[in-house]
Interface confidence: medium
C-alpha cells in the first residue's frame, strides 16, 4: 500500500533570464527512493541514481543544474520553459510517486511564488 | 582519445577468484562514473556494476550481489573488479565503460575473457 | 527492472536497403534509450542517444525515434559495415539492462 505524499512548490513564475528551483519532497514513508526522474512533459531532464548520483540530459545540460538535494535549479529562463515539470520517486516496495509543478516565465519582473500543495 | 584497456582475466576454477582492472586515458577519469558490463559467449550484453565518479556510490546487478565488488583508484586512472565466489555463468567476457553522468556509457574497452571452468 | 524486448532478433538485408529495428520497454522511459552496433569480437560502439541524438562521428544514416515505451532505429541505406549486432539498452534506472540484441546479416 503506498502511504507517502509529495509535497511540491506548487505553481511557480520565474522572470525570463532568471533562475528557479523546483523542489519535492517525499514524505509519510519508510519506501526506499531509488531514483528520482525529473521530466518537463514528457522529456526527462535528469534522474538522480540512489547508487550513481546525478546525470543530466546532454540536450539541457547548459542550463540544468543538479540540486539543492533532490530538486532541480533551471537557469537562463525563456518563455518555453513555461509549462509542466514532474518529480517521479522510484521507491522500494511503494513503487512510483509522481509530483507536478507548473512553472510561468514571465517577461515582467512581477514574478511572485505560488502556495505550497500537496500531492497524494 | 579516449581509451579504456581491460586487463586480469583469464581461466579459473568455480569458487574461485580474479581481479579485472581497467586503465582509462585520454580523459579526465575522475570525472566520470564507470561501469562493467560482461557479455557471455554467443551472447548478449548484461550489466555487471557502476560506481560513481568520486568512488563513493556502487550498484551491482543482482547475479553478482556480495561476490563481485568494484572500485576505483583515481590517481591512477584505474577501475576494478574484483571477483570472488565465481561460478561457471559468470565466464563471459567483461567491458568496462565510461559513463559521462551516473548511467549514461558513452566509450567502451575491448574486453577481457573470464572463463570459469574446472 | 526494466525489460528490454528488441525485434527482429535476426534480419537479412541487402546494401541500399531501408532497416527498421524495434525495441519496447517493459514501463515508460521517457527518452533515456541509447542504441549500440556490435561487431563480431569488437566493444559495442554508441551510435543514439537519449532516443534520438546521433553520436559524434556516426553517419547520418543512422536515425533513432520513440519515447515512452516503443523506440525504432533506423538505417536509411544499409552499408556494408553495417552488417552487425544492434542492441538497445535502457538508462532510465539501475540496474541498467539491455535489449537482446538484433543481428543484421547479409542477404
Known amino acids: 500500500m503506498m502511504t507517502g505524499t509529495i509535497e511540491t512548490t506548487g505553481n511557480i513564475s520565474a522572470e525570463k533570464g532568471g533562475s528557479i528551483i523546483l523542489q519535492c519532497h517525499l514524505s509519510s514513508t519508510t519506501a526506499q527512493v531509488t531514483q528520482v526522474n525529473w521530466e518537463q512533459q514528457d522529456q526527462l531532464l535528469a534522474i538522480c541514481n540512489a547508487d550513481l548520483g546525478w546525470h543530466i540530459s546532454p540536450s539541457f545540460k547548459d542550463r540544468v543544474a543538479p540540486g539543492p538535494g533532490l530538486g532541480l535549479t533551471l537557469q537562463s529562463l525563456t518563455v518555453n520553459d513555461t509549462g509542466e515539470y514532474f518529480c517521479i520517486y522510484h521507491t522500494y516496495p511503494d513503487g512510483t510517486y509522481t509530483g507536478r509543478i507548473f512553472l510561468e516565465v514571465l517577461e515582467s519582473s512581477v514574478a511572485e511564488h505560488g502556495a505550497r500543495f500537496q500531492i497524494p | 582519445e579516449v581509451q579504456l584497456l581491460e586487463s586480469g582475466g583469464g581461466l579459473v576454477q568455480p569458487g574461485g577468484s580474479l581481479r579485472l582492472s581497467c586503465a582509462a586515458s585520454g580523459f579526465t577519469f575522475s570525472s566520470y562514473a564507470m561501469h562493467w558490463v560482461r557479455q557471455a559467449p554467443g551472447k548478449g550484453l548484461e550489466w555487471v556494476s557502476g560506481?560513481?565518479?568520486?568512488?563513493?556510490?556502487?550498484s551491482y546487478a543482482d547475479s553478482v550481489k556480495g561476490r563481485f565488488t568494484i572500485s576505483r583508484d583515481n590517481s591512477k586512472n584505474t577501475l576494478y573488479l574484483q571477483m570472488n565466489s565465481l561460478r561457471a555463468e559468470d565466464t563471459a567476457v567483461y567491458y568496462c565503460?565510461?559513463?559521462?553522468?551516473?548511467?549514461?556509457?558513452?566509450?567502451w574497452g575491448q574486453g577481457t575473457l573470464v572463463t570459469v571452468s574446472s | 527492472d526494466i525489460q528490454m524486448t528488441q525485434s527482429p532478433s535476426s534480419l537479412s538485408a541487402s546494401v541500399g536497403d531501408r532497416v527498421t529495428i524495434t525495441c519496447r520497454a517493459s514501463q515508460s522511459i521517457s527518452s533515456y534509450l541509447n542504441w549500440y552496433q556490435q561487431k563480431p569480437g569488437k566493444a559495442p560502439k554508441l551510435l543514439i542517444y537519449?532516443?534520438?541524438s546521433l553520436q559524434s562521428g556516426v553517419p547520418s544514416r543512422f536515425s533513432g525515434s520513440g519515447s515512452g515505451t516503443d523506440f525504432t532505429l533506423t538505417i536509411s541505406s544499409l552499408q556494408p559495415e553495417d552488417f552487425a549486432t544492434y542492441y538497445c539498452q535502457q538508462s532510465y534506472s539501475t540496474p541498467l539492462t539491455f535489449g537482446g540484441g538484433t543481428k543484421v546479416e547479409i542477404k
Open positions: 565503460a565510461r559513463a559521462p553522468y551516473s548511467v549514461w556509457i558513452d566509450y
Open positions: 537519449a532516443a534520438s
Open positions: 560506481i560513481s565518479s568520486n568512488g563513493g556510490s556502487t
